[in-house]
Amino acid sequence: ATKLTEEKYELKEGQTLDVKCDYTLEKFASSQKAWQIIRDGEMPKTLACTERPSKNSHPVQVGRIILEDYHDHGLLRVRMVNLQVEDSGLYQCVIYQPPKEPHMLFDRIRLVVTKGFSGTPGSNENSTQNVYKIPPTTTKALCPLYTSPRTVTQAPPKSTADVSTPDSEINLTNVTDIIRVPVFN
């Protein structure tokens, strides 16, 4: 069985989470991509998605989440600005490919947001800036209601968190165990 890894991000309130999911561009360049949260004991919930078909380098904004799909580069950029403690959770990037199961991109991200802004330079933060200027050309895409025996996604809520990841794709039916990887700080 394919082992699903998990990367842990530890950030402070107010910081920006800025990540990439990489995918096989030959297969999925124009496919619709989505950012999901997985709550304990629940099915994945879609927080934001790209348009269908996904437009190249065209930002889509849902609340504090911004998705930008770079077709030429096989990369989906996921940003979440002004992180809140409540944004803590487990996230994943998926590719919609109806009527088949969504494809999940390795690996999941465990986001831990703690109180108090850190001025220490580090990954995915805009120095001491809490305000992230959102590109003026963003649009909001409608996410499909997608139900399957293993996966349920819903329309995006008003406020959520983001994070994503790269590496490779696996079909959600292949998910078995989760391996935790170390935190790099």
Epitope: E7, Y9, V19, D22, Y70
Partner: antibody, heavy 124, light 107 residues
Framework: QVQLVQSGAEVKKPGASVKVSCKAS????????INWVRQATGQGLEWMGW????????GYVKKFQGRVTMTRDTSISTAYMELSSLRSEDTAVYYC?????????????????WGRGTLVTVSS | DTQMTQSPSSLSASVGDRVTITCQAS??????LNWYQEKPGKAPKLLIY???NLETGVPSRFSGSGSGTDYTFTISSLQPEDIATYYC?????????FGGGTKVEIK
């Protein structure tokens, strides 16, 4: 020590292909994306694309699409960049560079480790 | 693509002088900017990342600042070993793009 060692200089004729290698040592090859950057004589730096050595995923700058192929052999910790249909303007030093990221999946494009470069000369 | 306009293209200064190089992006790059040093016959070396963070092992006389579309790289007190070409590189948008470079020489 931590380094990227590139293959030697090449002289090619227009229309031919060149394959440059980049061998990593001193770190886990599959943990960092490899990027390729070139510099024509007297010119600035130009990014060509990236590769995830763990899964083999790649992304290429539009200008090079259809002509460039980035591959790897994880068994020998080596990345490759092949450029086809060479023309005189492809004469340049080609660098491989490691993308450092505190978090593997973060949107950080800092190149903290570079090869010494491979000079590719295209001449008839 | 995001164009990076770097200036000046070259400069000559005395040892101990304060040297400033600027980079202007054609669109907002949200501090997603790095600075590299390239010496003749050698590979580029990362000096500053994410606009203002000093890379480990890099002397503190090097610094970076800026936001939005305008960024500045400063050498507070030029040393003989700083003779090189300096490049900015943005990653606020793909493709990644570099400035044209600034050649720094000693008077």
């Amino acid at each position: 020590q931590v380094q990227l060692v590139q293959s030697g200089a090449e002289v090619k004729k227009p229309g031919a292909s060149v394959k440059v290698s980049c061998k990593a040592s001193g770190y886990t090859f599959t943990s960092y994306d490899i990027n390729w950057v070139r510099q024509a004589t007297g010119q600035g730096l130009e990014w060509m694309g990236w590769m995830n050595p763990n899964r083999g995923n790649t992304g290429y700058v539009k200008k090079f699409q259809g002509r460039v192929t980035m591959t790897r052999d994880t068994s020998i910790s080596t990345a490759y960049m092949e450029l086809s249909s060479l023309r005189s303007e492809d004469t340049a030093v080609y660098y491989c560079a490691r993308r450092r990221a505190v978090y593997r999946s973060s949107w950080e494009w800092y190149f903290d480790l570079w090869g010494r470069g491979t000079l590719v000369t295209v001449s008839s | 693509d995001t164009q990076m306009t770097q200036s000046p293209s070259s400069l000559s200064a005395s040892v101990g002088d304060r040297v400033t190089i600027t980079c202007q992006a054609s669109q907002d790059i949200f501090n997603d900017l790095n600075w590299y040093q390239e010496k003749p016959g050698k590979a580029p070396k990362l000096l500053i990342y994410h606009a203002s963070n000093l890379e480990t092992g890099v002397p503190s006389r090097f610094s970076g600042s800026g936001s939005g579309t305008d960024y500045t790289f400063t050498i507070s007190s030029l040393q003989p070993e700083d003779i090189a070409t300096y490049y900015c590189q943005q990653y606020g948008n793909l493709p990644l793009t570099f400035g044209g470079g600034t050649k720094v020489e000693i008077k």
